[in-house]
């Protein structure tokens, strides 16, 4: 249903070796980074926090897709994570490395 | 080209009558809001102020389309504009009604 | 304020498996790290492995396979288990929050290994 | 995989100043921070310096780390050594592979 489409935080589980990032990530080996997704339609949902340009954007595309597209769900709160990693070659530890993961989505 | 398909501002006029808005905005008829249009494919570039949890959803993305979505072209930044407005009555203006267009696009 | 407290056995068979939790209070497990630490009667410290606060894990390799963390994030415990105790397994297992640095520790619990 | 040595004890004078060595066995000193805890008998470890030469809140600052490239060590400096200071220090370090690594230890005993 559209309801169940709708912009809303979802699992992914980012595995540092997958993306390469292991050659300075010692630990830990990945993480859950989460991601956005679903759809922003009008009239858009007051926990997803809209931005003015965001309602009248979506209003618009509504009205006219042709006009403007659709408002896009995106992260709009992060969270750091702890790593390990290698700074010019020392092992170092860093407890708040920021913005690596999810912890609201909304639509802008 | 690609690099013309890119996350960038583009314009988006708004006409308050066309979405409803003129029963409350007395002025201006319409403002130019812009709209963020376009991909973020890894690697994205730095005038799109990419958080790390957008780089990594690129990259994962693109070594996986079905693990991961595309960051997203939203606006990440926002202006105000000057209206005359209707308040419970009585034609009030506001210098700075805030959120209104889109100054700067980025990968979120 | 902050606590951590394990709970387990005081006495487990060799060859059996060895269940902990950690309990936690006074934080988030999503925001702070919880290692794992253990050390046999006069001797020293040993860490065996981090629940990290982004739901990664990492192990001591010394443990090899017999090793597994996990955590409820609802219900604010970290669990250890390992499988295929040995007597030389006997040891008082800690569990120790990670910020800046490790700032908290759970009084530990002596668990030994012994038919 | 390096290993952290430390020796097993030593004994110091109250209001003496003492200094305990953790010698990496392979590899460079500097190439990751140092940790050191504190562990009273039957007690609880406590952390004691943090990135090798930081000071947790509520930790004297008769406790100071460094660092000694030439011996490839760090150091724990106990200055105005006191009756409670009495316990056994763990040295710690990071490495790519055992990520989080201890000394042995070494029991300080004050006369």
């Known amino acids: 249903n559209a309801k169940g489409n709708y912009c809303k935080r979802t699992p992914l589980y980012i595995d540092f070796k997958e993306i390469g990032w292991d050659s300075w990530i010692i630990a830990p080996p990945g993480y859950e980074a989460y991601e956005c997704r679903g759809v922003c339609n009008y009239p858009l949902a007051e926990h997803l926090t809209p931005t003015k340009h965001a309602i009248i954007q979506a209003l618009v595309h509504l009205k006219n897709s042709q006009k403007a597209s659709k408002a896009c769900c995106v992260p709009t709160k992060l969270e750091p994570i702890s790593i390990l990693y290698l700074d010019k070659g020392v092992v170092t530890y860093k407890f708040k490395y920021e913005g690596m993961a999810v912890s609201e989505c909304g639509c802008r | 080209n690609a690099k013309g398909n890119y996350c960038k501002r583009t314009p988006l006029y708004i006409d308050f009558k066309e979405i409803g808005w003129d029963s409350w905005i007395i002025a201006p008829p319409g403002y130019e809001a812009y709209e963020c249009r376009g991909v973020c494919n890894y690697p994205l570039a730095e005038h799109l102020t990419p958080t790390k949890h957008a780089i990594i959803q690129a990259l994962v993305h693109l070594k996986n389309s079905q693990k991961a979505s595309k960051a997203c072209c939203v606006p990440t930044k926002l202006e105000p504009i000057s209206i005359l407005y209707l308040d419970k009555g009585v034609v009030t203006y506001k210098f700075k009604y805030e959120g209104m267009a889109v100054s700067e696009c980025g990968c979120r | 304020q902050v606590q951590l407290k394990e709970t387990g056995p005081d006495l487990v068979q060799p060859t059996q498996t060895l269940d902990i939790t950690c309990t936690v209070s006074?934080?988030?497990?999503?925001?702070?790290?919880v290692h794992w630490v253990r050390q046999p009667p006069g001797k020293g410290l040993e860490w065996m492995g981090t629940m990290w606060n982004g739901g990664g894990i990492d192990y001591n390799s010394a443990f090899k396979s017999r090793l597994a963390i996990s955590r409820d994030t609802s219900k604010s415990e970290v669990f250890l288990k390992m499988d295929s105790l040995q007597t030389d397994d006997t040891a008082k297992y800690f569990c120790?929050?990670?910020?800046?640095?490790?700032?908290?520790w759970g009084q530990g619990i002596m668990v030994t290994v012994s038919s | 995989q390096f290993a952290l040595i430390q020796s097993d004890s030593m004994s110091t004078s109250l209001g003496s100043t003492v200094t305990l060595s953790c010698k990496r066995s392979?590899?460079?000193?500097?190439?990751?921070?140092v940790y050191w805890y504190q562990q009273h008998e039957g007690r609880s470890p406590t952390t004691m310096i943090y990135?090798?030469?930081?000071?947790p809140d509520g930790v004297p600052d008769r406790f100071s780390g460094s660092i000694d490239s030439s011996s490839n060590s760090a150091s724990l400096t106990i200055n105005d050594v006191q009756v409670e200071d009495e316990a056994i220090y763990f040295c710690q370090s990071f490495s790519s592979g055992i990520k989080f690594i201890f000394g042995g230890g070494t029991k300080l005993t004050v006369l």
């Open positions: 392979t590899g460079n000193i500097g190439s990751s921070y």
């Open positions: 990135d090798g030469d930081k000071r």
């Open positions: 006074g934080f988030s497990l999503t925001t702070y790290n």
């Open positions: 120790a929050r990670l910020g800046y640095y490790v700032d908290y």
